[in-house]
């Protein structure tokens, strides 16, 4: 019969700077029922608030919907674990939504072999930014990365595409089936997961010669 162990807020992520979610790891439970609560205040304010939504992000999480999310404001948060023996607090975590964005993967990945008559053949890759990201406002600059490999190969070949949403690759092995994926990252923030793989069969007559 002990108080709960110290919890730890280990991750906060936002898909688009409009909402965000934080997750914590419970400490030891002390062998008793344990309640967790996340409290926060915004930098420069003293008023403490409790997590508005413990459900959306799954177990041991707090989700901040649009009405609770402000850009350019630092959130200072901590988790309190309580049982009948007492309470333990996580360390405070400072969160700026600008720096925790992890977008969804890019969408509509399309891959095509192009074989112009007068030029070298190439692999043409095209995609769309994730739906939740509004690039028109200028709030976001998304950077893209492509990876591809022959189906049975162990190593991925990685290409940085910058801000463009299409890319050409010239050097491929004829007759091989390739897997292609793309991911994106805001200027400040985290890489998205890789998009689902798209497969493309490279024709046997695909030539790499000049």
């Amino acid at each position: 019969q002990l108080p709960p162990g110290k919890p730890e807020i280990f991750k906060c992520r936002s898909p688009n700077k409009e909402t965000f979610t934080c997750w914590w790891r419970p400490g030891t439970d002390g062998g008793l029922p344990t309640n967790y609560s996340l409290t926060y205040h915004r930098e420069g304010e003293t008023l403490m608030h409790e997590c508005p939504d413990y459900i959306t992000g799954g177990p041991n999480s707090c989700h901040f919907g649009k009405q609770y999310t402000s850009m350019w404001r630092t959130y200072i948060m901590m988790v309190n674990a309580t049982n009948q023996m007492g309470s333990s607090f996580s360390d405070e975590l400072y969160v700026d939504v600008t720096y925790i964005v992890q977008p969804d993967p890019p969408l509509e990945l399309a891959v095509e072999v192009k074989q112009p008559e007068d030029r070298k053949p190439y692999l043409w890759i095209k995609w769309s930014p994730p739906t939740l990201i509004d690039l028109k406002t200028g709030w976001f600059t998304l950077l893209y990365e492509i990876r591809l490999k022959p189906e049975k190969a162990a190593e991925w070949e990685i290409h940085f595409a910058g801000q463009q949403t299409e890319f050409k690759i010239l050097s491929l092995h004829p007759g091989q089936k390739y897997l292609v994926q793309v991911r994106c990252k805001p200027d400040h923030g985290y890489w998205s997961a890789w998009s689902p793989a798209t497969f493309i069969q490279i024709p046997s007559d695909f030539t790499m010669n000049d």
Epitope: Q1, L2, P3, D29, G31, L32, P33, Q84, M85, G86, S88
Partner: antibody
């Protein structure tokens, strides 16, 4: 009201075992557990270990690890402490205690275990 | 294991006196400290938990203080029923440990 009622005094021979019970009432037994503390004659309090009625977890003081078993029975809201291989050094009053709202807020009346040949 | 050292081990005082018993932990116990009163032939009674919080039904003449490793129990105006043995206990980590006790006697 909350009550912890312990079984009666026991006299045991060295090498024997003893099983002390602690019947709980007046609170939700399954959200807590039973802790055991002993007190040798004229000595201080010594924590022995505990058994959780919430998740079945047990923790024992190293000194007792090999010869004590603590259990809780949620159907009868009773905690048990069994000690084996008794010696005269185990002569003591054995208390059960629990956590209802605050740490160790309720105690049993104590059970005197005398180990004598 | 966390050692709990109480002082003094015994104390003589008169009715109406204010007395303080101290307890030192061998390492930081995050204020997970309790104080118990025990009278001869009786079970311990919890007075204070979390270093300074009064258990329900305990008179306010008992107060606890301190933090980190150094703690104290103060009885503001001794009454005859307060003469007993007092124990501190840490419940920050296993094994839970008690101080050796302070016997409070009538002078």
């Amino acid at each position: 009201q909350v009550q912890l009622v312990q079984s009666g005094a026991e006299v045991k021979k060295p090498g024997a075992s003893v099983k002390v019970s602690c019947k709980a009432s007046g609170y939700t037994f399954g959200t807590s557990g039973i802790t055991w503390v002993r007190q040798a004659p004229g000595q201080g309090l010594e924590w022995m270990g505990w058994s959780s009625a919430y998740n079945g977890k047990t923790d024992y003081a190293q000194k007792f690890q090999d010869r004590v078993t603590m259990t809780t029975d949620t159907s009868t809201t009773t905690g048990y402490m069994e000690m084996r291989s008794l010696t005269s050094d185990d002569t003591a009053v054995y208390y059960c205690t629990t956590v209802v709202r605050r740490p160790f807020d309720f105690w049993g009346q104590g059970t005197l275990v005398t180990v004598s040949s | 294991d966390i050692q709990m050292t109480q002082s003094p081990s015994s104390l003589s005082a008169s009715v109406g006196d204010r007395v303080t018993i101290t307890c030192r932990a061998s390492q930081d116990i995050n204020n997970f400290l309790a104080w118990f009163q025990q009278k001869p032939g009786k079970a311990p009674k919890s007075l204070i938990y979390a270093a300074s919080s009064l258990q329900s039904g305990v008179p306010s003449k008992f107060s606890g203080g301190g933090s980190g490793t150094d703690f104290a129990l103060t009885i503001s105006s001794l009454q005859p029923e307060d003469f007993a043995t007092y124990y501190c206990q840490q419940y920050s980590s296993y094994p839970i440990t008690f101080g050796q006790g302070t016997r409070l006697e009538i002078k």
